[in-house]
Structure formats: structure tokens, C-alpha cells
């Protein structure tokens, strides 16, 4: 049970990081007007990924795109890539994990494939949720110095001489919304890998062993028996087998023609 | 159309207080700024604040803090300027203006207050 | 508090002459986030308010005569008037409408020969 929960978990919790990570790419408010001190001016600047927004006092807002590839900052274009490369990765560790998970029966697929599929897909979130967060932290490791570079312009232009009004930017919703929604990703995705650890036959010293009948031969499935942890009392009555160690929840009963994947 | 109605003159002693109104009709009154702006007889334009009447937020000209306080009133669809402890420095017209919707213009300007401040 | 330079003034010209007047602001009012610049002309004739010319520097208020024409960028704008007409009789602020607190030039007084 606490293996399928933690599987369970794990996904919900990765599936709402990578829709995170997904809304805080697509959101505007990467790095918003800075209004500490007071708004000294009438409109409201607010960048994102792909367009940056003024919203003038009336409420109007307007968005342009970036409709250049080559004359954006090489920073920037990192940035996409790591969203990208993590939405990629979390929509593919998502699909994998929907088949790894213990509560869908697909054919008669083995613990073990599960178990493997449900790491797959851990790894895939931790990864997704990384490049998240470091993509969201290399933005806003860019608007820090950005920020510093014009405070210091503002007091420092043409030799003190003239004071600049310069527009500051500082940072928006979404790089909140990435850093918990990388955070959230990368969490479902070590609950995915302590779940297939839950999943994975432990090996043992015994191997599994054929019993052979004077008449005929006998192989012994582990189904047929009630899970064991093969040590203690009563013991000859039954027979260890590769991974005897399972849970109650972890008894399989194998599909009939009546169960639906 | 949009109509900015004013009164045409207000006489008030020195030190008192006057209250400008300015109503509004031709379009919905909350949805844009309302700005009020200052003008000395044979002299330029000065800003003196603007306030929306959707939820009563302004901002004022730092040199007319204190002396201007901007109000609305929603039912009547009517827009006030108190001016306190009036000077002979306060006498001069005083326009309210609809902010436009696109830029941070003034689309629409009333008629004008002449305020005059006499003993 | 951003200043706002207007000149010549007065202007004195002849009917359907061409006229350009500057208005040069201590600060650019260019904004990088959409490119535009918060400047306002205004034309204010005898006795009455003002009136809105032209916005954003060089788009013309709905209703203008395109006789005027609005252009500049960052610090220093220009108000044309292709052919100067009687009703033109007037004096012309700009604005600028970015920063706090809004302020004006003070102002061009047009006078027709």
C-alpha cells in the first residue's frame, strides 16, 4: 500500500509541477517594473519569455513579441532552452510513469518493468524539475545584475551631473511560479525513486527453486502463495523465492480476460 | 458625447477652503482617470493629481500635496477638487480632464473653474 | 521633475506657410517596453480648454486635420503644421505624460500675419 501511495504521490505531485512549469513559461511577469519607490512613471513594464507587456494607467495593455531570434540575449535563449528541455522531459516522464503506475494494469506486465518504467520517469522529473529551477535561477541571476548595474547608473550618470530615471526591473510571478513548480517536479520525482525501490524484487541469496515430482514436474509460482517474509515459524510449509519479501499490497493477482487495462 | 461640466467662477476669501466640481457624462465614469489641472491667468499648464474613480486611487503632484485633495463621487458620477488655505498664489483656472483609454493623454478637458481668491 | 522646453515662442507666420515648433524634454520619454514615447501636443485657442492633437508623440487624436504632424524620439519632438491656417491661431504645449509628476512646456503661441 505505502508503495502505491508513494507511486501515486509522486506523480500527482510531478504532474503539477510540470503544469507549473509549463504556466510559468508562458506567463508575462518573468521580471516586472520594480515600483519600490513609488511608480515614477505613468505605464507599467513587465517581460516574459517571449513578448514583453507595458500596461498604461487606463488599465490598456499592449504585448509585443520578441520576433527575433538572433538579437536576443544569449542568456535568454538559455533560459527558453532549460523550460523547454524541462517540459520535454517532464511530458515524457509523465506518459512513462502513467504506465509504470501500479494501480493500471497493462497485459501482464512484470513488477520489475514497472519498477524500471517507475525510475525512468523519476529520473526524468528530478531532471525536468532542475532545468527548471535553473533556468528560472539563471533569469533571475540576470535581473540582480541588471538591477545593481542601473542603481549605480542612476547616481553615477555623466559624472553626477545628470540624474537618470531609469526603469528597474525586478522579479515577476512566474519566477516564483518556476522555482516551486521545479521544486514540486523534482520532489514527484524522488517519490517515483523510492517507489520503484519499493517495486523492484529485492534480490536475495536464494534463487527460485524448481521442485521436481517423482511424476511430474512442478513449477512453483510465487502467486499461488500469501506473501512471506520466508523467515521465523512455519517456513517448510512454504517456499522462498526471489524477492519473497513483499508487502500485502504487493500480492499479484494475474489479469483474466475480465480485467481492463 | 463626453461632457466635462464645470462651474464657471468661484470667489473665496484668503485662507479659506473651495471645492471644484466637475461632472461627468457621455461615457463610464470609472473607467478612466480623471485629471485636474492648474492655470494661471496669461501663464502655462500645471498638473496637480488625477484619481480613478473605480476604487478612488490617485496620485498627486508633490508641489500640490496638501493643498489639493481629489475626491469622487460615484452615484453622481462627479469628480471634486478641494483646495485648502487658499493664497492669491491660488487664484487661476482649474480644469478636470478625462484621461484617454490607450495613451496617458488628456482626451477630454471641461470648461474650466476660474477661482479667485480675494479679500 | 522632468522638464519640458518648448520654442520658438511666439511664432509669428504667414497663412499656408510651413511651421515647426520643438519641444526638447530633460529626459528621454522613450519607453523601451513598447517603443514609444510619452509625449502629448495640445493646442489651446483663446477662452477655451485645451485640446488633444496628437499623442504619442506622432499619432493624431481622431477628428485632427492631418496638416499636423507629430515626430521625435527620446528627448526632442517636433509639431508641424504643413499649411498654417487662420483657426491654427493658437498656443501649443507638450506634454509629458511618462513620468510623475505630468509636466508641460510652456508653451508656443502661434500668430498668423
Known amino acids: 500500500m505505502a508503495v502505491t501511495a508513494c507511486q501515486g504521490l509522486g506523480f500527482v505531485v510531478s504532474l503539477i509541477g510540470i503544469a507549473g512549469i509549463i504556466a510559468a513559461t508562458c506567463m508575462d511577469q518573468w521580471s516586472t517594473q520594480d515600483l519600490y519607490n513609488n511608480p515614477v512613471t505613468a505605464v507599467f513594464n513587465y517581460q516574459g519569455l517571449w513578448r514583453s507587456c507595458v500596461r498604461e494607467s487606463s488599465g490598456f495593455t499592449e504585448c509585443r513579441g520578441y520576433f527575433t531570434l538572433l538579437g536576443l540575449p544569449a542568456m535568454l535563449q538559455a533560459v527558453r532552452a532549460l523550460m523547454i528541455v524541462g517540459i520535454v522531459l517532464g511530458a515524457i516522464g509523465l506518459l512513462v510513469s502513467i504506465f509504470a503506475l501500479k494501480c493500471i494494469r497493462i497485459g501482464s506486465m512484470e513488477d520489475s518493468a514497472k519498477a524500471n518504467m517507475t525510475l525512468t520517469s523519476g529520473i526524468m522529473f528530478i531532471v525536468s524539475g532542475l532545468c527548471a529551477i535553473a533556468g528560472v535561477s539563471v533569469f533571475a541571476n540576470m535581473l540582480v545584475t541588471n538591477f545593481w548595474m542601473s542603481t549605480a547608473n542612476m547616481y553615477t550618470g555623466m559624472g553626477g551631473m545628470v540624474q537618470t530615471v531609469q526603469t528597474r526591473y525586478t522579479f515577476g510571478a512566474a519566477l516564483f511560479v518556476g522555482w516551486v513548480a521545479g521544486g514540486l517536479t523534482l520532489i514527484g520525482g524522488v517519490m517515483m525513486c523510492i517507489a520503484c525501490r519499493g517495486l523492484a524484487p529485492e534480490e536475495t541469496n536464494y534463487k527460485a527453486v524448481s521442485y521436481h515430482a517423482s511424476g511430474h514436474s512442478v513449477a512453483y509460482k510465487p502467486g499461488g502463495f500469501k506473501a512471506s517474509t520466508g523467515f521465523g515459524s512455519n517456513t517448510k510449509n512454504k517456499k522462498i523465492y526471489d524477492g519473497g519479501a513483499r508487502t500485502e499490497d504487493e500480492v499479484q493477482s494475474y489479469p483474466s480476460k475480465h480485467d481492463y487495462v | 458625447q463626453v461632457q466635462l461640466q464645470q462651474p464657471g467662477t468661484e470667489l473665496v476669501k484668503p485662507g479659506a477652503s473651495v471645492k471644484v466640481s466637475c461632472k461627468a457624462s457621455g461615457y463610464t465614469f470609472t473607467t478612466y482617470w480623471m485629471h485636474w489641472v492648474k492655470q494661471r491667468p496669461g501663464q502655462g499648464l500645471e498638473w496637480i493629481g488625477r484619481?480613478?474613480?473605480?476604487?478612488?486611487?490617485?496620485n498627486y503632484n508633490q508641489k500640490f500635496k496638501g493643498k489639493a485633495t481629489l475626491t469622487v463621487d460615484k452615484s453622481s458620477d462627479t469628480a471634486y477638487m478641494q483646495l485648502n488655505s487658499l493664497t492669491s498664489e491660488d487664484s487661476a483656472v482649474y480644469y478636470c480632464?478625462?484621461?484617454?483609454?490607450?495613451?496617458?493623454?488628456?482626451?477630454?478637458w471641461g470648461q474650466g473653474t476660474l477661482v479667485t481668491v480675494s479679500a | 521633475d522632468i522638464v519640458m522646453t518648448q520654442s520658438p515662442s511666439p511664432l509669428t507666420v504667414t497663412a499656408g506657410e510651413k511651421v515647426t515648433m520643438t519641444c526638447k524634454s530633460s529626459?528621454?520619454?522613450?519607453?523601451?517596453?513598447?517603443?514609444?514615447?510619452?509625449l502629448t501636443w495640445y493646442q489651446q485657442k483663446p477662452g477655451q480648454p485645451p485640446k488633444l492633437l496628437i499623442y504619442w508623440a506622432s499619432t493624431r487624436e481622431s477628428g485632427v486635420p492631418d496638416r499636423f504632424t507629430g515626430s521625435g524620439s527620446g528627448t526632442d519632438f517636433t509639431l508641424t503644421i504643413n499649411s498654417v491656417q487662420a483657426e491654427d491661431l493658437a498656443v501649443y504645449y507638450c506634454?509629458?505624460?511618462?513620468?510623475?509628476?505630468?509636466?508641460f512646456g510652456s508653451g508656443t503661441k502661434l500668430e498668423i500675419r
Open positions: 506634454q509629458n505624460d511618462y513620468f510623475f509628476p505630468f509636466t
Open positions: 480632464a478625462m484621461g484617454a483609454y490607450f495613451s496617458n493623454s488628456f482626451a477630454y
Open positions: 529626459q528621454t520619454l522613450l519607453n523601451r517596453g513598447n517603443q514609444k514615447n510619452y
Open positions: 484619481i480613478r474613480p473605480s476604487d478612488s486611487d490617485s
